[in-house]
């Protein structure tokens, strides 16, 4: 980028530059029209018969340097060929010299600084590449010369440019003084300010554009070269903040539109809101969950919103004494999550009707909560109790929901308790054909023993037809019609109002071989 300090083509008034010395044959200002019919100013000099050592100086007005360290001067000029000048002597030249003088203010006068090299600093002696030929009575023909010179390094507030003619016939058509600067640049969402290079290369710190944040790593910088170009090099730049995406060729961050979001800073574009969420404003980093939908704390910000599951379905119970096996089907609605678990709540009601949460004597296998499979075994049920189990399905957002948790209930009533097994049978008397048995009255928890059932069969005769039964209301019995000297296996069970208890252990008894032995009391 070039910043103009002076362009004579754009000056609308007389330039009125200073000349020295005040003699004939000096530089003079002329005017004309350019291609756009704008008036332009030029300077001419043509003292080809000058006295030896006589120089004609032309000095511009004071030019503030505006922070430039190096300034470029583009001269457009024409130079008359000495050979085409009939009056030209040996002092005719086809070159001129350019100088500059620095000062902190417009302090130069018609006589100061002294018109010579030092204090003036020589830039270059300029030779014409193209010479203009002039034939008597004909128009001069020749190309315009264009020469760009470099001034500096400059350090004071401004400077003057000066031209020294020592016998040329020439026209200075235009002068363009400019400096080069690196234009403001936005790359990778990083803005680098307009920079005037003060050295060969100057590091320039960048800043993130609006709604961008620095990327990890070193702060972004670019190098501004002396020629006004940014040095090509990768930029660790910035990235758009959450809720914003890169736009316009990575030069700005644009807010995510309604209905879209961007959860993290960095590359990537705004995405539509995930299921069951919405964003009503622009620039959303996260989409809000619809009513009744939630994100668990561990869910990513871009995850869909989910809801607690519905209740489990079809709970089936299988009661086996004091054990209960429950199983159920998964809920119809999982809530959109994979982390489904089940939990049970339990209430028990005594036969009298008073109810309370289940006591600690119940055990659940694998447990009462955090069940991942749809079943549980409950042990330690008490007889003649009614149990209500509420099976609930839970997921990662159940704890965030308000309101009742849906459940599927199941009621189970255990049987009343039957008498315990009768196990301490003893033979009180035996004969070759009979056995007299007695046993202790079992402690029946649910009322008195109403009667007993004795089950017996000859040892070795295992078939169902060989088994015989005898009922007795007392805690004794006499088995008749037995074989002589035979072994019998006997079992007894008690009956209460709750029903028969289990048969006790088999008792081994033997009839007498001989009648003469008589009845013999056998104590167990």
């Amino acid at each position: 980028l070039e910043e103009t300090l002076l362009n004579t083509k754009l000056e609308t008034a007389d330039l009125k530059w200073v000349t020295f010395p005040q003699v004939d044959g000096q530089w003079e200002e002329l005017s004309g029209l350019d291609e756009e019919q704008h008036s332009v100013r030029t300077y001419e000099v043509c003292d080809v018969q000058r006295a030896p050592g006589q120089a004609h100086w032309l000095r511009t007005g004071w030019v503030p340097r505006r922070g430039a360290v190096h300034v470029y001067a583009t001269l457009r000029f024409t130079m008359l060929e000495c050979l085409s000048l009939p009056r030209a002597g040996r002092s005719c030249k086809e070159t001129f010299t350019v100088f500059y003088y620095e000062s902190d203010a417009d302090t130069a006068t018609a006589l100061t600084p002294a018109w010579m090299e030092n204090p003036y600093i020589k830039v270059d002696t300029v030779a014409a590449e193209h010479l203009t030929r002039k034939r008597p009575g004909a128009e001069a023909t020749g190309k315009v010369n264009v020469k760009t010179l470099r001034l500096g390094p400059l350090s004071k507030a401004g400077f003057y440019l000066a031209f020294q003619d020592q016998g040329a016939c020439m026209a200075l058509l235009s002068l363009h003084l400019f400096y080069k600067k690196c234009a403001q640049l936005t790359v990778n969402l990083t803005r680098f300010p307009e920079t005037v290079p003060r050295e060969l290369v100057v590091p320039v710190a960048g800043s993130c554009v609006v709604d961008a944040v620095p990327a990890p790593g070193p702060s972004p910088s670019l190098y501004c070269r002396e020629d006004g170009q940014w040095a090509e090099q990768p930029v660790t730049g910035c990235s758009c903040a959450p809720g914003f995406e890169a736009a316009e060729g990575n030069t700005k961050c644009r807010a995510c539109a309604q209905g879209t979001f961007k959860p993290l800073s960095g590359e990537g574009s705004c995405q539509p809101c995930p299921a069951n969420s919405h964003s009503n404003t622009i620039g959303s980093a996260v989409c809000q969950c619809r009513v009744g939908y939630f994100r668990a704390r561990t869910d990513p910000r871009g995850a869909p919103c989910t809801t607690p599951p519905s209740a489990p379905r079809s709970v089936v119970s299988r009661l086996n004494g004091s054990s209960l096996h429950l199983e159920w089907s998964a809920p119809l609605e999982s809530g959109g999550r994979e982390d489904l678990t089940y939990a049970l709540r339990c209430r028990e009601c005594r036969p009298g009707g008073s109810c309370a949460p289940c006591g600690g004597d119940l055990t659940f296998d694998p447990g009462p909560r955090d069940l991942v499979e749809p079943w549980v075994v409950v042990r330690g049920l008490r007889p003649d109790f009614t149990y209500t189990f509420e099976v609930t399905a839970l997921n990662g957002v159940s704890s965030l929901a308000t309101g009742p948790v849906p459940f599927e209930p199941v009621n189970v009533t255990t049987d009343r308790e039957v008498p315990p097994a009768v196990s301490d049978i003893r033979v009180t008397r035996s004969s070759p054909s009979s056995l007299s048995l007695a046993w202790a009255v079992p402690r029946a928890p649910s009322g008195a023993v109403l009667d007993y059932e004795v089950k017996y069969h000859e040892k070795g005769a295992e078939g169902p037809s060989s088994v015989r039964f005898l009922k007795t209301s007392e805690n004794r019995a006499e088995l008749r019609g037995l074989k002589r000297g035979a072994s019998y296996l006997v079992q007894v069970r008690a009956r209460s109002e709750a029903g028969y208890g289990p048969f006790g252990q088999e008792h081994h008894s033997q009839t007498q071989l001989d009648e003469s032995e008589g009845w013999r009391e056998q104590l167990a």
Epitope: D14, E29, L30, S31, G137, A140, A171
Partner: antibody, heavy 126, light 108 residues
Amino acid sequence: QVQLVESGGGLVQPGGSLRLSCAASGFTFNNAWMSWVRQAPGKGLEWVSGISADGVHKFYADSVKGRFTISRDNSKNTLYLQMNSLRAEDTAVYYCARKGMSFYNNKYAKSMFDLWGQGTLVTVSS
Amino acid sequence: DIELTQPPSVSVAPGQTARISCSGDNLGKKYVHWYQQKPGQAPVLVIYYDSKRPSGIPERFSGSNSGNTATLTISGTQAEDEADYYCSAWTTTMMHIVFGGGTKLTVL
């Protein structure tokens, strides 16, 4: 010798037309930017019109724009001023004047008039 | 456009210095030229580019220009210098020339 000689003045009625000529000699006419300057009786100088050396660019004072036309014939070393729709206030001595010339580039000129003709009187009256 | 203002008349004794002013807005930023016109004659350029003297013009004629005023100075005025003097400059539109109203110099 270097000189400019005007001709074509005279008495003309309001609304009438007149054509002034200026014959140049002693210098390279086709390198010179030329102008017409007038002076009403007892008044000051007033620039009227100007023309570039090649005749391409023409300039007029607001007071004559649309009525006067400047032209030149470089082959005849002559400058012209065609005056139409003349008014009484156009009565004046009309001078032909040369601008300071470039050494060799007729696209440019100095801003002063360094050579004047003797003038020709134009009287507009009924 | 610029307007140039001159005093209608200036009187000077022979041998004295005559100063004729020409004023206009920011005139010092423009080049001013001076013309001498004697009765019945065409104007003659006496000073150009503020202070330059054409060949053939006596050294007693000089000019300056700064601020809003340009001045034509005639040192050691002579009777033959009695004439009307006009300043001129061009307007913002480059090719349009404007003249001052003229100053009649009387040599007493």
